[in-house]
Interface confidence: medium
Amino acid sequence: LEVQVPEDPVVALVGTDATLCCSFSPEPGFSLAQLNLIWQLTDTKQLVHSFAEGQDQGSAYANRTALFPDLLAQGNASLRLQRVRVADEGSFTCFVSIRDFGSAAVSLQVAAPYSKPSMTLEPNKDLRPGDTVTITCSSYQGYPEAEVFWQDGQGVPLTGNVTTSQMANEQGLFDVHSILRVVLGANGTYSCLVRNPVLQQDAHSSVTITPQRSPTGAVEVQVPEDPVVALVGTDATLRCSFSPEPGFSLAQLNLIWQLTDTKQLVHSFTEGRDQGSAYANRTALFPDLLAQGNASLRLQRVRVADEGSFTCFVSIRDFGSAAVSLQVAAPYSKPSMTLEPNKDLRPGDTVTITCSSYRGYPEAEVFWQDGQGVPLTGNVTTSQMANEQGLFDVHSVLRVVLGANGTYSCLVRNPVLQQDAHGSVTITGQPMTFPPEA
């Protein structure tokens, strides 16, 4: 019995759902009563999910797996793994038995994008040319381990005096801290780039240091210049900090987070107490860090509707405020490709190829190209529809006249995540049937 799985690893983002594709070719007269299907972890042989005696036997893997019951009779034995975790990474084997046995293993590669790095300076005031400063670049909750690069304002790599550490949290996600020690010139820009090697996602931040006194008077409130990018469903930290003076106590602090445009209250701290969330009970401060001047806000289970500007107001004796932007994003699924017609194709036939990718944000950019990488722009129609959560489903249709044979690729790009999802189909100019997508 021939069991087919994808050759390449399936890449899944932490917290999203992944489909481990597996298919077999049912013979005429096949009935589900004959099917025995087992999914297991390849290495430990731990049972993940099974189907037997005409019935789905259910998940044996943290109740996070499901089959596609309506597709089993057509030979689709794929497994849906929900709310992917780092610990799920590895090889899964699909065993199919009807009269004969067959099996194949598919690899799951888990990934999580790194947050936009936050940059801190030590010391951070009264800096003069010739002073030695320590610049720390911190990026959070990524997987797998990152590659970190430093460069100056001219793009010249800085390799000396760099120390990088990566620590995994309980979920297996890495927090990266990279420290650069430099001697200040008249002024200078220092950039840190954190790369996710699997997603080919780069997160970067820079700091420009002008060695001179910072103005006194009002409370200086610092937030990141660039938008904070957060994936739908994950938690985001809107960073905000102030410099407490010696003898500062939380009883003196008034902190308010609000939506910049509508001034709607989000969270507040006053009279030495956290006054709690006024924003769908999805916000929290970092109480243990407030006394050190960390007024950051944690926004849980980010939604598309959260996108926008948040203002952090700090009052001790004086007032100060600053606004930080939240950019929400969701990766697009690997495109599925369909052909119409999909049988008995001959050179000269006109076919419609549809490329569909789901549940991304913001709107995608779609590109078509042929097997030689030449862009195909004519006869392309792309539509994008937002669902109730504000996530977009993309459908792009290409009409082509078949040559002797040809490959047609569709690339769906998320402009914020710089994430490319692509699918392709190869059509040979002879009578053929397009295989069903797993």
Epitope: N254, I256, Q258, K263, T270, Q275, A278, S315, F319
Partner: antibody, heavy 117, light 112 residues
Framework: EVQLVQSGAEVKKPGSSVKVSCKAS????????MHWVRQAPGQGLEWIGL????????NYNEMFKNRATLTVDRSTSTAYMELSSLRSEDTAVYYC??????????WGQGTTVTVSS | DIVMTQSPLSLPVTPGEPASISCRSS???????????LRWYLQKPGQSPQLLIY???NRFSGVPDRFSGSGSGTDFTLKISRVEAEDVGVYYC?????????FGGGTKVEIK
Amino acid sequence: EVQLVQSGAEVKKPGSSVKVSCKASGYTFSSYWMHWVRQAPGQGLEWIGLIHPWSGSTNYNEMFKNRATLTVDRSTSTAYMELSSLRSEDTAVYYCAGGGRLYFDYWGQGTTVTVSS
Amino acid sequence: DIVMTQSPLSLPVTPGEPASISCRSSQSLVHSNQDTYLRWYLQKPGQSPQLLIYKVSNRFSGVPDRFSGSGSGTDFTLKISRVEAEDVGVYYCSQSTHVPYTFGGGTKVEIK
């Protein structure tokens, strides 16, 4: 001594808007939250929402979210509550009340708003 | 929304005698910061409400010590140890743990 002095009584037609003011004195206006509460004739008290004068942060009772607008003028230490699309059920005494986000200690004398055609 | 239920609706009292008003909430009033934001107000005839008790049992400044508050979670009580003629009016309990903040329906205290 803390004082909250509200504007005078208003008579309005259905569908129109009303703007009630509340001038504060005797404390640092910018540092405390201002709440608005109303009381229909012979009825209990109903919380409309609150505003923080310094940041302008607001939090509304969902029941009033689309019709009530809370604002402040820090230069005159005055808070305002505007209610639009008035209907007869909005006939009530409207109070401002100053305090923290989770409480209100001091109340204005109240402003009677009558909605009648 | 949190529903605040007061009893009795009306309370005829004799000066010098004690009085007690009950207030029950439809959900616990313990805030995430562990405080309980339950208050008692008195509205005298023709006046604005005035604060008597905050955070269940704390007397506001200037409030006579004959007024006391108690309770926890969802059940709260206001007691007047010896009623005086000036104590007449409508008493309201109020919660500000959950948005929207809500009030009880009021208890009218009058001299017999």
